[in-house]
Interface confidence: low
């Protein structure tokens, strides 16, 4: 049994920031779950992770240099991405895994959202050039 995910087909980030809402056919209330956002047709870059545990505060992090925040709804997770670069325009996929209670569940691959970063051309620092194009 797989969780279904709905995403908007295309979002335009005018000021290098965008809210991407991942809507699930599953209620996350009182569940331990890991929601993530992935960049590229091959989902090679894990952009942001929202980890929820009914007994702890929501954890939001990125291990790939993205500036992200996350908000939880009963059947949705919204990722707020900031400081996006124009060359990070790509297709982004929502993923969800429910670890507890059993059984472990994950989602059918969603159809993805094209995020078109249309805002100012931010210049990546030489020390951290930002995630590369796939």
């Amino acid at each position: 049994n797989k969780i279904l995910v709905k995403q908007s087909p295309m979002l335009v980030a005018y000021d290098n920031a965008v809210n991407l809402s991942c809507k699930y056919s599953y209620n996350l209330f009182s569940r331990e779950f890991r929601a993530s956002l992935h960049k590229g047709l091959d989902s090679a870059v894990e952009v942001c992770v929202v980890y929820g545990n009914y007994s702890q505060q929501l954890q939001v992090y990125s291990k790939t240099g993205f500036n992200c925040d996350g908000k939880l709804g009963n059947e949705s997770v919204t990722f707020y991405l900031q400081n996006l670069y124009v060359n990070q325009t790509d297709i982004y996929f929502c993923k969800i895994e429910v670890m507890y209670p059993p059984p472990y569940l994950d989602n059918e691959k969603s159809n993805g959202t094209i995020i078109h970063v249309k805002g100012k051309h931010l210049c990546p620092s030489p020390l951290f050039p930002g995630p590369s194009k796939p």
């Epitope: 709905k6 087909p9 249309k118």
Partner: nanobody, 117 residues
Framework: EVQLVESGGGLVQAGESLRLSCAAS????????MAWYRQAPGSQRELVAA???????YYADSVKGRFTISRDNAKTTVYLQMNSLRPEDTAVYYC???????????WGQGTQVTVSS
């Protein structure tokens, strides 16, 4: 079910032009976004151009100024006018359309574009 019919691919010389078209038919509720991807041999599929229902447009840097995406909402058709073609534009070009209220992407079968030098 939705059908996408792509046409316009072919073999051209560098510097020449081609116009791809993709017509969507079937159980179309509303078309939100229409896009073109391409995949060259041994490469990942790449987003080339996209246009949404209010005609906001995206182009990959590699095609800016050479390719133009447009859509005919009445005919539920998307076009890709490709000018000043280069050998590196050689790829299979896929039409990608979001045609339902469920935010579901449909992919065409692809049309081959070959640019010889």
């Amino acid at each position: 079910e939705v059908q996408l019919v792509e046409s316009g691919g072919g073999l051209v010389q560098a510097g020449e032009s081609l116009r791809l078209s993709c017509a969507a038919s079937g159980s179309i509720a509303s078309i939100k976004t229409m896009a073109w991807y391409r995949q060259a041999p041994g490469s990942q599929r790449e987003l080339v151009a996209a246009i949404n229902y209010i005609k906001e447009i995206y182009y990959a840097d590699s095609v800016k100024g050479r390719f133009t995406i447009s859509r005919d909402n009445a005919k539920t058709t998307v076009y890709l006018q490709m000018n000043s073609l280069r050998p590196e534009d050689t790829a299979v070009y896929y039409c990608v359309v979001d045609v339902t209220k469920e935010d579901y992407w449909y992919w065409g079968q692809g049309t081959q574009v070959t640019v010889s030098s």
